[in-house]
C-alpha cells in the first residue's frame, strides 16, 4: 500500500499556501484527485510529487494515491481543505446524472470543516427540498440524495451558514433518469372470453412503463387490430390502452388474441382465447368415480367440475335417501372459481353415519337448462356375528349370521376348551363356507349371509366358533356347549361404536 | 463561530507539573493542527508546541524534554502539561488554532488564526 | 533556532501617518513570514501570511512585503483603531516570534 507524506488524513491550509503531497510506493505510483489548477506533478521512480505554490478553494479535495502494480489494489488518501472565507464550497461537477433508486452525489466540497454543523441542501432560488428527500452530507464528498426518484431531477444549491448567513454554492443540475428494467408490463383482459354469438365483448390490452417510449398493439390470430389508443400517466408509470368493443360478435371474432408490447429492451406479449357459442352450455363432470365407498366413521368430499356460460344462476346438492330425509348442511358445501367459466364445487361429508349412505345429487341451472350429477356413496361395515344352537330336519346345527359390506366370508372353528377365541394352538378343526347364504342384499345397506355348521354331537369340553371378515375388519361368536344346553359368547371385540 | 478557552490552575509551585485544557467550541477539532504560545511578562511569544487531532506533535525544542501534549477529540479539547517548572516558566498562555501556509512531505506550517484570551500561570511557593 | 528581530521596538504616530515596521530573520525564511496585532487584554490577531497575503477582513491599508530575511508591514493611513502591538512570525523551521512593536499615539 503506497503512504502519503505528510502522513495525516487531512488537512486545512490557507488561500495562496504551497503545498506538496509526496506518495511512495513499491513500484509506480499514481495520483488521483478533484480537477483543479495550480498543481504540477512530478515523479521519479517509486515516488510522485503533488505540488503547488498558490492553493485556492479549487484544490479542496481529496488527493488518493494507487499503485497499478499492486494486485491488491491499494491506496492512500489526503483530504486538503483550502479555507476560503469567500468560498465556503469547491463545486467539482455542475450536472451529475445517475439513474433512479441509485444515490445521487452532489459533489460540493466544504472549504472549512468547521462549517460542517451549519450546511444545508435546497433547491435553486432558495425552495425547499421536494417532501421525501432523504440525504446526508460529508465535507469530503458532499450531499447524498439517496435512493434518487425522477421527480427529484432539479438544480440545487449548497448552502453554508458563515457568520449568522447562508453562502450559497453553484447550482448543481441532478439529472435522474427512469431505470426501463425491461419490456413494457402487460395486461391484457379478460383472460379468457366466452360469448353467445349476437352478444357483447370487450378486450382491453394495456402496458405500462417508467419511459413514455414504447408501443403497443392488439392481434388477432396475428393480424394487427387498428384500435386508438388512450395514454394516461399515473403512480409514476406511462400507460396505454388499446380497447376493443365488438357490439355483436360472431363466429369470425373467436380465435386468439395477442397484447404485444415493445421498448428498447425487448418485447412482452401476452394472449387469450376468445370462444364464440352458438347457445348457452353448462357441464358438469368429476374427476372421482361416481359410485364412492367409504368405512363407517370416515369423511369424503364429494367433488364437481362445472364448464357454464352464461354464469349460474343457481345450485345445490341433494340428498335423495334412501334411509332419512335429511339434506347436506349448507356449510359443508363449498364453491370456488378456478376462472370466469370453470367452477369447482365441493360438499364435505365428515365422519359418515349409516343414515347418510345413499345418492347425493349436485343440481345446476343456467340459461341452458338444468343439469344434475349423482354419487352414489356406500358405507363399508365391519362384521357383526352371532351364533344360535338350533335343529334343523332333526339335526342338530350351528347356525351363524354375519352382517356387515361388503359381504362377510365365513370360517368355522372348533378348538378344545372353553374360551372366548380360539387361539392357534387350541384349533383343532377349521371349515370355510365358501357360499354362504346371503339373507339381505339391499343397495347401501348391510349385507347379512348365514351359514351352518352341522354338529351330530357336540362335544362339552370344547369351543365352536363363527367368524366372519371382509375388507373392513373382522367378528366372531364363540359356542360353548354345557350339560344343561347351551351358551355363547360373543367377544368384546364385537361391541362395535362406529 | 469557533472559539478557544483555555483552563488551568493560575498558581503552581516549583519543580511540579503545570497542566492546562484549551476547550474548543463552535466546531470540530477535527482536521487542524493546535498549538500552545506564551508570553512571560515584559517577553515575547515563544511557540510551546502543537499537536493534531490524530495525537502526532511538535515541540519547541528548547521545552521538548518537559512538555507532552494530548488531545481528546471526544471532549473536542487539547491539553498541555509541562513539568519541573521554575519561576521563568510564569507567563500567560494561550492556545491557538494554526492554519497551514506550508505543506510539504516532512514538515508543515502556518499561522494562528483562532487564539484563546490567555490565562495567566503563575509559578511560586 | 531562527531569530526574528523587529524594530523599531516603539513608534509613536498620528492618525493619518504611514507607519512602516520592519522584521529581520536570523536565516532565510523565504516568504514563510506572518504579522499579527495585539491590543491589551485581547488575543493577537492575524493580519498577514505568507509574507504579503492579507488575510480575509483586515483592512487593505494594511500591507506586507519582503522575502528571503527582510520583511516590512505597512499601514498606509494609521486609523484610531491601529494603535496597538504588532509581532511578526517565521513559520520556516518551528515557530518564533519577534519581540513586538508597539505603535502609539504621537
Known amino acids: 500500500i503506497p503512504v502519503i507524506e505528510p502522513s495525516v488524513p487531512e488537512l486545512v491550509v490557507k488561500p495562496g499556501a504551497t503545498v506538496t503531497l509526496r506518495c511512495v510506493g513499491n513500484g509506480s505510483v499514481e495520483w488521483d484527485g478533484p480537477p483543479s489548477p495550480h498543481w504540477t506533478l512530478y515523479s521519479d521512480g517509486s515516488s510522485s510529487i503533488l505540488s503547488t505554490n498558490n492553493a485556492t478553494f479549487q484544490n479542496t479535495g481529496t488527493y488518493r494515491c494507487t499503485e497499478p502494480g499492486d494486485p491488491l489494489g491499494g491506496s492512500a488518501a489526503i483530504h486538503l481543505y483550502v479555507k476560503d472565507p469567500a468560498r465556503p464550497w469547491n463545486v467539482l461537477a455542475q450536472e451529475v446524472v445517475v439513474f433512479e433508486d441509485q444515490d445521487a452525489l452532489l459533489p460540493c466540497l466544504l472549504t472549512d470543516p468547521v462549517l460542517e454543523a451549519g450546511v444545508s441542501l435546497v433547491r435553486v432560488r432558495g425552495r425547499p427540498l421536494m417532501r421525501h428527500t432523504n440525504y446526508s452530507f460529508s465535507p469530503w464528498h458532499g450531499f447524498t440524495i439517496h435512493r434518487a426518484k425522477f421527480i427529484q431531477s432539479q438544480d440545487y444549491q449548497c448552502s453554508a451558514l458563515m457568520g449568522g448567513r447562508k453562502v450559497m454554492s453553484i447550482s448543481i443540475r441532478l439529472k435522474v433518469q427512469k431505470v426501463i428494467p425491461g419490456p413494457p408490463a402487460l395486461t391484457l383482459v379478460p383472460a379468457e372470453l366466452v360469448r353467445i354469438r349476437g352478444e357483447a365483448a370487450q378486450i382491453v390490452c394495456s402496458a405500462s412503463s417508467v419511459d413514455v417510449n414504447f408501443d403497443v398493439f392488439l392481434q388477432h390470430n396475428n393480424t394487427k387490430l387498428a384500435i386508438p389508443q388512450q395514454s394516461d400517466f399515473h403512480n409514476n408509470r406511462y400507460q396505454k390502452v388499446l380497447t376493443l368493443n365488438l357490439d355483436q360478435v360472431d363466429f369470425q371474432h373467436a380465435g386468439n388474441y395477442s397484447c404485444v408490447a415493445s421498448n428498447v429492451q425487448g418485447k412482452h406479449s401476452t394472449s387469450m382465447f376468445f370462444r364464440v357459442v352458438e347457445s348457452a352450455y353448462l357441464n358438469l363432470s368429476s374427476e372421482q368415480n361416481l359410485i364412492q365407498e367409504v368405512t363407517v366413521g370416515e369423511g369424503l368430499n364429494l367433488k364437481v367440475m362445472v364448464e357454464a356460460y352464461p354464469g349460474l344462476q343457481g345450485f345445490n346438492w341433494t340428498y335423495l335417501g334412501p334411509f332419512s330425509d335429511h339434506q347436506p348442511e349448507p356449510k359443508l358445501a363449498n364453491a370456488t372459481t378456478k376462472d370466469t367459466y370453470r367452477h369447482t364445487f365441493t360438499l364435505s361429508l365428515p365422519r359418515l353415519k349409516p343414515s347418510e349412505a345413499g345418492r347425493y345429487s349436485f343440481l345446476a341451472r343456467n340459461p341452458g337448462g338444468w343439469r344434475a350429477l349423482t354419487f352414489e356413496l356406500t358405507l363399508r361395515y365391519p362384521p357383526e356375528v352371532s351364533v344360535i344352537w338350533t335343529f334343523i330336519n332333526g339335526s342338530g346345527t350351528l347356525l351363524c349370521a354375519a352382517s356387515g359390506y361388503p359381504q362377510p366370508n365365513v370360517t368355522w372353528l372348533q378348538c378344545s376348551g372353553h374360551t372366548d377365541r380360539c387361539d392357534e394352538a387350541q384349533v383343532l378343526q377349521v371349515w370355510d363356507d365358501p357360499y354362504p347364504e346371503v339373507l339381505s342384499q339391499e343397495p347401501f345397506h348391510k349385507v347379512t349371509v348365514q351359514s351352518l355348521l352341522t354338529v351330530e354331537t357336540l362335544e362339552h369340553n370344547q369351543t365352536y366358533e363363527c367368524r366372519a371378515h371382509n375388507s373392513v375388519g373382522s367378528g366372531s361368536w364363540a359356542f360353548i356347549p354345557i350339560s344343561a344346553g347351551a351358551h355363547t359368547h360373543p367377544p368384546d371385540e364385537f361391541l362395535f361404536t362406529p | 463561530q469557533v472559539q478557544l478557552q483555555e483552563s488551568g490552575p493560575g498558581l503552581v509551585k516549583p519543580s511540579e507539573t503545570l497542566s492546562l485544557t484549551c476547550t474548543v467550541t463552535?466546531?470540530?477539532?477535527?482536521?487542524?493542527?493546535w498549538s500552545w504560545i506564551r508570553q512571560p511578562a515584559g517577553k515575547g511569544l515563544e511557540w510551546i508546541g502543537r499537536i493534531y487531532t490524530s495525537g502526532s506533535t511538535n515541540y519547541n525544542p528548547s521545552l521538548k524534554s518537559r512538555v507532552t501534549m494530548s488531545v481528546d477529540t471526544s471532549k473536542n479539547h487539547f491539553s498541555l502539561k509541562l513539568s519541573s517548572v521554575t519561576a521563568a516558566d510564569t507567563a500567560v498562555y494561550y492556545c491557538?488554532?494554526?492554519?497551514?501556509?506550508?505543506?510539504?512531505?516532512?514538515?508543515?506550517?502556518?499561522?494562528?488564526?483562532?487564539w484563546g484570551q490567555g490565562t495567566m500561570v503563575t509559578v511560586s511557593s | 533556532d531562527i531569530q526574528m528581530t523587529q524594530s523599531p521596538s516603539t513608534l509613536s504616530a498620528s492618525v493619518g501617518d504611514r507607519v512602516t515596521i520592519t522584521c529581520r530573520a536570523s536565516?532565510?525564511?523565504?516568504?514563510?513570514l506572518a504579522w499579527y496585532q495585539r491590543k491589551p487584554g485581547k488575543a493577537p490577531k492575524l493580519l498577514i501570511y505568507?509574507?504579503?497575503t492579507l488575510e480575509s477582513g483586515v483592512p487593505s491599508r494594511f500591507s506586507g512585503s519582503g522575502s528571503g530575511t527582510e520583511f516590512t508591514l505597512t499601514i498606509s493611513s494609521l486609523q484610531p483603531d491601529d494603535f496597538a502591538t504588532y509581532y511578526c512570525q517565521q513559520f520556516n523551521s518551528y515557530w518564533t516570534f519577534g519581540q513586538g512593536t508597539k505603535v502609539e499615539i504621537k
Open positions: 505568507k509574507a504579503s
Open positions: 463552535g466546531g470540530s477539532i477535527s482536521s487542524y493542527y
Open positions: 536565516q532565510s525564511i523565504s516568504s514563510w
Open positions: 491557538a488554532r494554526e492554519i497551514l501556509v506550508v505543506v510539504a512531505a516532512t514538515r508543515t506550517g502556518g499561522v494562528f488564526d483562532i
